[in-house]
Each structure stands twice: as structure tokens, then as C-alpha cells.
């Protein structure tokens, strides 16, 4: 008898999955700019706002070069995933000055959850160690003001535009290893 | 068309060693995370390790833990698994496994009896 | 005893629906890791049927598709065909082992 049969190509394989993580990101990024700009209109911003429980930026334009494709996959992924629970949170909690926005959140909110499936599955194919995408998070609690909601979501858009900028070019560097 | 191919297979006394090997063709090996999956006769599907596309993480059930070696060569395309203090137990056919698993080998049969 | 957990059987005649059942605990499925299914026709190797809970791998009929919700996964076969008489499995990435579960497995029967 001959050699066994092969199997199909699946739908896509670890290069190809970067190459779409690299599209989503992108395309999140821009998302992002533009509600981030869209709230600034409707809510100037009275400078920069934070929030201590968004993650602290995990790169910087120095520390590119070094970049470890396990280390950035994983820190992206907790990263956004961290994003993605402040979305759910502002949209849950963040009253009725936020409900205009609710359209452009729900698709930011569908849209993160896309590209964290997709890294998922990159991480998977790659066989790299996976931290759990539901891990227990401090409980973020209602706004203390609508003013206060305002406030948060300039510092979640601002800090998931600074995420998803760095994630890009990391996520470049790192199809040049693959 | 993607191919794998298992060999190394075959009858062991109990305390045995064996190594099985995976030949890979037609897709890039090397962006792959590889696996070993068992399955004993009439009985379902058990993982058994895994490695990463570059080598750098391995992963073992319970079961093989301290017995069982995975290793990669992807520059030659090829997969391995040591088995050493081989167990009655242990008997399956053995499937090589690429990706999510995305990909499997037909399988080699493994009997471990005295 | 598998990690997963599915029905040991299901059945349907030509042209059903069928849906196979899939639960897992809170380092897998209920962790947030995707769900993949696998078809085994008897004498061959496991095939990728579905993988991230809902997408289909290229050649794979539309008559199948996934779903998951928080710690169980469904597999659904409509328009049931003789030739999907096999065993199907669930897998899922578990976060304490560093690698893939399986369920059981479900023999599927076309009546």
C-alpha cells in the first residue's frame, strides 16, 4: 500500500492567524481613535485621565527589539482581556450620559472579543502556555458620578488606543520570527 | 496536503522502551505546536504531550509524566516521543498531532505485554 | 474517566437534527478556552470538524456547526446523513495541564 492519505489544509495556519490578529488589531485601533475622538467632542477631556485598575503599557518603542513572541502574546492577551471587562463594565455602569455611545461600545466590546478568540487560537496552534481568558479580576464598582463615568472611559479609550498601538507593532515584529 | 506519519510502533515487555517518530510534510512544521494523542483499544482520545513550535514548552498528563520525553528536530521535520518504563497500560494506538490538534497521522500501534 | 464530558450515545434518522452535549469545569471550558470537535469514522484517524467553538475548517458542510456557553459546548448535525455515523469528541484547552482535553466521546448512530 501507499502512503496514508493527507489531510486538507485547514482554514488558516499560525502565520496566517498573526496576519489576522495584525488586521484586527488594526482595524480595533481605529475603533478605538475614532470613539476616543467622538467623546472627546461630546465630553471634552480636562486633561489625562486614569484608572487603577486598567494594566499598566507593557512596552515601550525601546524594549521592541527584545520582544519574545510567548511573553508578548500572553501579556497582550491578559492586557486585553482586562480592556474587555472594562468595556462590559462601562457599558453596564456607565449611566445614561454613555448610553449615546452604547452602539460604538457594543461593537468595540464584539470586536475585542474577536481578536482575543483569534490569539487564543494562535496561542493554541503555537502550543505556547495560555493564561486562563476568565481570570478572577478585582470587581470594579459603579462610577462615582456621571462625570466620574466620563472620566473612565476616556481612560479606558485612551489606554486601549496606547495597548493596541504598541500590540501592533509588536505583533509585525513578531511575523518576522515566525 | 498536509502528511504525517507515525512509525517507531510496535511489542514491548512491561518496563520497555520505545521511540515513535512523526514525519511532517506539506506545511511549515516549524510555526506548528505538535502533540501526542492516544487512544487505547475500543476507548477514546487521550492527550498525552505537547511542544511548542520552537521547542521551548513541554507538557505531559499525569499519566506519562517522568516516563514519556517529547521532543522536535524542525530541521528535519520530525516529531519524537521517548517512552521508557513502559506499563501494560500504556498499550494505544498513537497519534501525532499538529496545531489545535488542526492535523493527525494515521497512528502506530503500541503493545506493551509480556 | 475523560475530563470533558459527553453523552456515550446519540442517534437520529436521515435528514434530523442531532445535537451532542459537551460540559467541562472551570479550568477548561468554563475558563474562556475555545471548544474544538472532532469526527472519527471507524478504522481512521480523528478529523478537525469545528474549531473556536463555531468555525468550520475549509470542506467541512455547513450541516455542522458549534456553540458554547459558559462551562458546556453543543455540536449540532442537521440534515443527518448516513455517512456522519462516527464518533465525535470535544476538546478544549485546560488551563492546570498546559494541553488539550477530551470528552469521551459520543458514538452517533443514523438509525
Known amino acids: 500500500p501507499g502512503p496514508p492519505a493527507g489531510s486538507p489544509r485547514v482554514s488558516s495556519d499560525p502565520r496566517a492567524d498573526l496576519d489576522s490578529a495584525v488586521l484586527l488589531t488594526r482595524s480595533l485601533l481605529a475603533d478605538t481613535r475614532q470613539l476616543a475622538a467622538q467623546m472627546r467632542d461630546k465630553f471634552p477631556a480636562d486633561g489625562d485621565h486614569s484608572l487603577d485598575s486598567l494594566p499598566t503599557l507593557a512596552m515601550s518603542a525601546g524594549t521592541l527589539g527584545s520582544l519574545q513572541l510567548p511573553g508578548v502574546l500572553t501579556r497582550l492577551r491578559v492586557d486585553l482581556m482586562s480592556y474587555l471587562r472594562h468595556v462590559q463594565w462601562l457599558r453596564r455602569a456607565g449611566g445614561p450620559s454613555l448610553k449615546t455611545l452604547e452602539p460604538e461600545l457594543g461593537a468595540l466590546q464584539a470586536r475585542l472579543e474577536r481578536l482575543l478568540r483569534r490569539l487564543q487560537l494562535l496561542m493554541s496552534r503555537l502550543a505556547l502556555p495560555q493564561a486562563a481568558p476568565d481570570q478572577p479580576v478585582i470587581p470594579l464598582g459603579p462610577p462615582a458620578s456621571a462625570w466620574g463615568s466620563i472620566r473612565a472611559a476616556h481612560a479606558i479609550l485612551g489606554g486601549l488606543h496606547l495597548t493596541l498601538d504598541w500590540a501592533v507593532r509588536g505583533l509585525l515584529l513578531l511575523k518576522t520570527r515566525l | 496536503e498536509v502528511q504525517l506519519l507515525e512509525s517507531g510502533g510496535g511489542l514491548v515487555q512491561p518496563g520497555g522502551s520505545l521511540r515513535l517518530s512523526c514525519a511532517a510534510s506539506g506545511f511549515t512544521f516549524s510555526s506548528y505546536g505538535m502533540h501526542w494523542v492516544r487512544q487505547a483499544p475500543g476507548k477514546g482520545l487521550e492527550w498525552v504531550s505537547v511542544i511548542s513550535y520552537d521547542g521551548s514548552y513541554k507538557y505531559y498528563a499525569d499519566s506519562v509524566k517522568g516516563r514519556f520525553t517529547i521532543s522536535r528536530d524542525n530541521s528535519k521535520n520530525t516529531l519524537y516521543l521517548q517512552m521508557n518504563s513502559l506499563r501494560a497500560e500504556d498499550t494505544a494506538v498513537y497519534y501525532c498531532?499538529?496545531?489545535?490538534?488542526?492535523?493527525w497521522g494515521q497512528g502506530t500501534l503500541v503493545t506493551v505485554s509480556s | 474517566q475523560s475530563v470533558l464530558t459527553q453523552p456515550p450515545s446519540a442517534s437520529g434518522t436521515p435528514g434530523q437534527r442531532v445535537t451532542i452535549s459537551c460540559t467541562g469545569s472551570s479550568s477548561n471550558i468554563g475558563a474562556g478556552y475555545d471548544v474544538h470537535w472532532y469526527q472519527q469514522l471507524p478504522g481512521t484517524a480523528p478529523k478537525l470538524l469545528i474549531y473556536s467553538n463555531n468555525e468550520r475548517p475549509s470542506g467541512v458542510p455547513d450541516r455542522f456547526s458549534g456553540s458554547k456557553s459558559g462551562t458546556s459546548a453543543s455540536l449540532a448535525i442537521s440534515g443527518l446523513r448516513s455517512e456522519d455515523e462516527a464518533d465525535y469528541y470535544c476538546?478544549?484547552?485546560?488551563?492546570?495541564?498546559?494541553?488539550?482535553?477530551f470528552g469521551g466521546g459520543t458514538k452517533l448512530t443514523v438509525l
Open positions: 476538546a478544549a484547552w485546560d488551563g492546570s495541564l498546559n494541553g488539550p482535553v
Open positions: 498531532a499538529a496545531g489545535v490538534p488542526d492535523y
